[in-house]
């Protein structure tokens, strides 16, 4: 760029020593530096000036969109939260079930011993009753009444 | 820095107002100032640079930075909506557990009711049973038949 | 600002082409240039550097913030990862209490039937206990004994 | 160098309004959040509002929310508190504040400061 | 609200001592705390952002620390000038809030 150009040429001026007063052209090559360094700076300036502005932009941006992931984050770790209370219940519930169905097993085990002890109780009762039945005389018909009638008769 | 040195020297130049000539003194002062100016601004211009360029490889660090975590927070919202689901068809497979278990429970009761009244029961068909085997006369050894046969013969 | 002024007021430097001499005034015309040209780039310096030390001011909370950000994303995707194994070994559990209950409600549901075949049975001891309990002869009163001990008196 | 010149402030009676302005310089305006703060006398600093770079967002302290309105107008460089339904509990020193940053909100540079006195 | 408690409310203290001063807050807020210096008739002045960096231009006296719930803002040696009051500010997260103030009075 130009202002990367050194100015070496100014240590040249006036090569006559003796002379009190300044050459012309000297003055128009201070000039001539003194204008390209101006539109050096104007340049630069100018370019700074849109690189610092772009960058800011970009940083707002940034910023609108941090802002943006925070509260996502935040509304995350919320729900989250939420989730875990809600498995936490879900896990008390499912111990709670757990333990009913334990229950209900012992209960239903103890049932299915006393229908057990129930059904040998009635096999039981129709052995004896079956004995019970075979064993009846038939009211009309008692073989011992029976015999003795004859007997007498 | 070379730019924040005030270039009052100038204001001296020519003290002799009635020369209508410039003395090379004077302008190898404005000579030395444009190159120290040059100086400055070229040192500024390079560390602005620098400056600017670490900016912006900062905020292009940032930008993939916060894309990545950007995806990363969608892909959690994302996950964590899958694990609300999950959750809820777990609450729900949790209440039909639940319901069936208090339904066994229920079917249970009912049964253990009913399982009393089946022993009760079979408890007076025992009893009866047992009071109809003692109140059973011997087949062969009716009473009556015996002091009746005494008596005939 | 003071570095947007272009200074072509340089191109009218001494008009006299035959003079071998700078005039004073050039001179004097040369040196506020030069002047203003160091105040504006001063300005420019110092605003420069303090909308460039804004921006790493800027970046530095930003990059604290990111840091954060991700800590915090990093968590969040931690306990996820927590949660989703813990509703994993809840669906496990789940299934199992399911299972049990299924298995439960086969059992009750055999058990009902057995029930159901037990008071049966019951009921048919019932009736034939009923029978046999209405057919039995009084011991002290059999009709034939009575008739017969009539018939031999 | 950066400034930020207050102006607005005076005695209102209370449910009457009042527009305080912060005019800025010295810096980019369209390129900071700023803020509005409070100190009722003698009591600390309250935050009462922010409005971001563009203007689009804003938000406020549940005190003022719904009665005072935050804006701003880049082109003019300056910073507005619309102030409406004052109470007795709005006197205070109203400062206005820019940020570093505004989701992580550093006041940087403050106002002067403006008086607004809410009394029958 | 991200509530901030600052201990104390009052402190005489001497030219030369050294000074802390804490601010607890409600929450954890990370390092994302701010020290504001006001003295009487004049607008606060930041001292410190996140925690513990320090303003361009001020004394590096001051000095912050802390990440959390706890932070302390210590003068290592109090000056004439230091003699004001000083606020904490969380940045966390709007609403922002302050602490309650405390003031540093010539012993």
């Known amino acids: 760029s130009r202002i990367d150009q050194d100015n070496s040429s100014f240590d040249s001026l006036s090569p006559e020593p003796k002379s009190r007063f300044a050459m012309l052209d000297d003055v128009k090559i201070l000039a001539n530096g003194l204008l390209q360094l101006g539109h050096g700076l104007k340049d630069f300036v100018h370019k700074t000036k849109g690189q610092i502005n772009d960058i800011f932009q970009k940083l707002n941006i940034f910023d609108q969109s941090f802002y943006d992931l925070s509260l996502q984050t935040s509304e995350i770790k919320e729900e989250e939260k939420e989730l875990r209370r809600t498995t936490y219940k879900l896990q008390v519930k499912n111990e709670e079930v757990k333990n009913m169905s334990l229950e209900l097993n012992s209960k239903l085990e103890s049932l299915l011993e006393e229908k057990i002890l129930l059904q040998q109780k009635v096999k039981y009762l129709e052995e004896q009753l079956t004995n019970l039945i075979q064993n009846q005389p038939e009211t009309p018909e008692h073989p011992e009444v029976t015999s003795l009638k004859t007997f007498v008769e | 820095s070379r730019i924040d040195q005030d270039n009052s020297s100038f204001d001296s130049l020519s003290p002799e107002p009635k020369s209508r000539f410039a003395m090379l003194d004077d302008v190898k002062i404005l000579a030395n100032g444009l190159l120290q100016l040059g100086h400055g601004l070229k040192d500024f211009v390079h560390k602005t640079k620098g400056q600017i360029n670490d900016i912006f490889q900062k905020l292009n660090i940032f930008d993939q930075s916060f894309y990545d975590l950007s995806l990363q927070t969608s892909e959690i919202k994302e996950e964590e909506k899958e694990l609300r689901r999950t959750t809820y068809k777990l609450q729900v497979k949790n209440e039909e557990v639940k319901n069936m278990s208090l339904e066994l429970n229920s079917k249970l009761e009912s049964l253990l009711e009913e399982k009393i009244l089946l022993q009760q029961k079979v408890k007076y068909l025992e009893e009866q049973l047992t009071n109809l085997i003692q109140n059973q006369p011997e087949t062969p050894e009716h009473p009556e038949v015996t002091s009746l046969k005494t008596f005939v013969e | 600002s003071r570095i947007d002024q272009d200074n072509s007021s340089f191109d009218s430097l001494s008009p006299e082409p035959k003079s071998r001499f700078a005039m004073l005034d050039d001179v004097k015309i040369l040196a506020n240039g030069l002047l203003q040209l160091g105040h504006g780039l001063k300005d420019f310096v110092h605003k420069t550097k303090g909308q460039i030390n804004d921006i790493f001011q800027k970046l530095n909370i930003f990059d604290q913030s990111f840091y954060d950000l991700s800590l915090q994303t990093s968590e969040i995707k931690e306990e996820e990862k927590e949660l989703r194994r813990t509703t994993y070994k809840l669906q496990v559990k789940n299934e199992e209490v399911k299972n049990m209950s299924l298995e439960l409600n086969s059992k009750l549901e055999s058990l009902l039937e057995e029930k159901i075949l037990l008071q049966q049975k019951v009921k048919y001891l019932e009736e034939q206990l009923t029978n046999l309990i209405q057919n039995q002869p009084e011991t002290p009163e059999h009709p034939e004994v009575t008739s017969l001990k009539t018939f031999v008196e | 160098e950066v400034q930020l010149v207050q102006s607005g402030g005076g005695v209102v009676q209370p449910g009457r309004s009042l527009r305080l302005s912060c005019a800025a310089s010295g810096f980019t305006f369209s390129n900071y959040g700023m803020h509005w703060v409070r100190q009722a006398p003698g009591k600390g600093l309250e935050w009462v509002a922010v409005v971001w770079y563009d203007g689009d967002n804003k938000y406020y302290a549940d005190s003022v929310k719904g009665r005072f309105t935050i804006s701003r107008d880049n082109s003019k460089n300056t910073l507005y508190l619309q102030m409406n339904s004052l109470r007795a509990e709005d006197t205070a020193v109203y400062y206005c504040?820019?940020?570093?940053?505004?989701?992580?909100?550093?006041?940087?540079?403050w106002g002067q400061g403006t008086l607004v006195t809410v009394s029958s | 609200d991200i509530q901030l408690t600052q201990s104390p409310s009052f402190l005489s203290a001497s030219v030369g001592d050294r000074v802390t001063i804490t601010c607890w807050a409600s929450q954890g807020i990370n390092s994302y705390l701010a020290w504001y210096q006001q003295k009487p008739g004049k607008a606060p002045k930041l001292l410190i952002y996140?925690?513990?960096t320090l303003q361009s231009g001020v004394p590096s006296r001051f000095s912050g620390s802390g990440s959390g719930t706890e932070f302390t803002l210590t003068i290592s040696s109090l000056q004439p000038v230091d003699f004001a009051t000083y606020y904490c500010?969380?940045?966390?997260?709007?609403?922002?809030?302050f602490g309650g103030g405390t003031k540093v009075e010539i012993k």
């Open positions: 504040a820019r940020d570093i940053i505004t989701s992580r909100p550093t006041l940087d540079y």
């Open positions: 500010q969380q940045l966390n997260s709007y609403p922002l809030t």
């Open positions: 996140p925690a513990s």
